[in-house]
């Protein structure tokens, strides 16, 4: 079941997926000039069983200038006895991420992509907050929201974090400055709290906020 | 509450233009694709087209290419199905729905009854 | 693109079970596992009953169950009641980006 709204935006933080629940989207975008192949995919889907996950279907972006004028050969979604075995890895992911059941990577870049990309998550969704650079956990509750269903509905949970300046407060007793790059990832989705000096993007992509969509940018 | 909300019926004479409407509301409604369906009197359903709010790429039925426009205004959330030249056999309901997740149409309008007759 | 097939009509009486076949090609059914099921009440909207071939959204009965074979899908209603009746219609996405449904069932509940 999709999730009707986007993670709850905090001041001052981004969120991001460590892995993506089975039936999340992630939409065929492309850069300025450039447009999904005519009969491309429209998104990718992180579909599977129960003992491997991975990305159905390839976004293809072609220029806007020049038309097709020969045909081009599709990569289209696989039929479910043909599916890939092996997982779609990107040299940028850290081996872990998508050790969790029913959960797909982040997928690799593709030709011409937009700088943003929009996910589509669904019920079951764990996303993480970090304090964006220059800024500080204040606070040390759980940094991470899921997507619930409750009485048919889907709501996100609220993260519990604060990220202020670094000159606005001392820093609070035994937490540590934020690293350059803290190798600490959460082991459970269910048991872990997450603040900003645990947690750390682990790709070459940052989550950025916009209103009404959840986007990753390319920096 | 994730809706989609389609324009009032339409009683129109043969050759005559007409658009309607579908607004998307409560979900990113320009993220999400949104797909045109013809349900002709007793008759079943029909894939027109879906379009793409966000940049309006559009893809047609081959049976409907030619012989409707799909566009979007994603500033005001909304999709449209427009006729240049209406015909009697254009006398339909039509639906409008968001694609979802594994290429299904997961929220439907309501539809809109366009009635063409001379 | 021709319409997937399925039967016209199909009725049984309340607690018994129906099946309804969607047969398309190896272009659409047989190619991927994007089928779906629509349930249409008289004078309603289409409804989502289930995508992914099995899958079902919240909501719906597990009473509600699919399977696909080759390039035949097919609807199973267990414990027939009289507000299923309805018409059904199966949907396929296809190997060139676009969409296909079926005809349609017509489901008395006697």
């Known amino acids: 079941e999709l999730c009707d709204d986007d993670p709850p935006e905090i001041p001052h933080a981004t969120f991001k997926a460590m892995a993506y629940k089975e039936g999340t989207m992630l939409n065929c975008e492309c850069k300025r000039g450039f447009r999904r192949i005519k009969s491309g995919s429209l998104y990718m889907l992180c579909t599977g069983n129960s003992s491997h996950s991975s990305w159905d279907n390839q976004c293809q972006c072609t220029s806007s200038a020049t038309r097709n004028t020969t045909k081009q050969v599709t990569p289209q979604p696989e039929e479910q006895k043909e599916r890939k075995t092996t997982e779609m890895q990107s040299p940028m992911q850290p081996v872990d991420q998508a050790s969790l059941p029913g959960h797909c990577r982040e997928p690799p870049p593709w030709e011409n992509e937009a700088t943003e990309r929009i996910y589509h998550f669904v019920v079951g969704q764990m996303v993480y907050y970090q304090c964006v650079q220059g800024y500080r956990a204040l606070h040390r509750g759980p940094a991470e929201s899921v997507c619930k269903m409750t009485h048919g509905k889907t709501r996100w949970t609220q993260p519990q974090l604060i990220c202020t300046g670094e000159m606005e407060t001392s820093q609070f007793p035994g937490e540590e400055k934020p690293q350059a790059s803290p190798e600490g990832r959460p082991e459970s989705e269910t048991s872990c709290l997450v603040t900003t000096t645990d947690f750390q993007i682990q790709t070459e992509m940052a989550a950025t906020m916009e209103t009404s969509i959840f986007t990753t940018e390319y920096q | 509450q994730v809706q989609l909300v389609q324009s009032g019926a339409e009683v129109k004479k043969p050759g005559e233009s007409l658009k309607i409407s579908c607004k998307g509301s409560?979900?990113?409604?320009?993220?999400?694709?949104i797909g045109w369906v013809r349900q002709m009197p007793g008759k079943g359903l029909e894939w027109m087209g879906i379009?793409?709010?966000?940049?309006?790429?559009?893809r047609y039925s081959p049976s409907f290419q030619g012989q409707v426009t799909i566009s979007a205004d994603k500033s005001i959330s909304t999709a449209y199905l427009q006729w240049s030249s209406l015909k009697a056999s254009d006398t339909a309901m039509y639906y409008c729905?968001?694609?979802?997740?594994?290429?299904?149409?997961?929220?439907w309008g309501r539809g809109t009854m366009v009635t063409v007759s001379s | 693109q021709s319409a997937l097939t399925q039967p016209a009509s199909v009725s049984a009486s309340p607690g018994q079970s129906i099946t309804i076949s969607c047969t398309g090609t190896s272009s659409d059914v047989g190619a991927y596992i994007y089928v779906s099921w629509y349930q249409q009440l008289s004078g309603k909207p289409p409804k989502l009953i289930l995508y992914d071939v099995s899958k079902r959204p919240s909501g719906i009965s597990d009473r509600f169950s699919g399977s696909k074979s080759g390039n035949t899908a097919s609807l199973t209603i267990s414990g027939l009641q009289a507000d299923d009746e309805a018409d059904y219609y199966c949907s396929s996405y296809t190997r060139s980006s676009t969409w296909v449904f079926g005809g349609g069932t017509q489901l008395t509940v006697l």
């Open positions: 379009i793409y709010p966000g940049d309006s790429d559009t």
């Open positions: 729905a968001r694609l979802g997740s594994y290429y299904a149409f997961d929220i």
């Open positions: 409560g979900y990113s409604s320009t993220s999400y694709w």
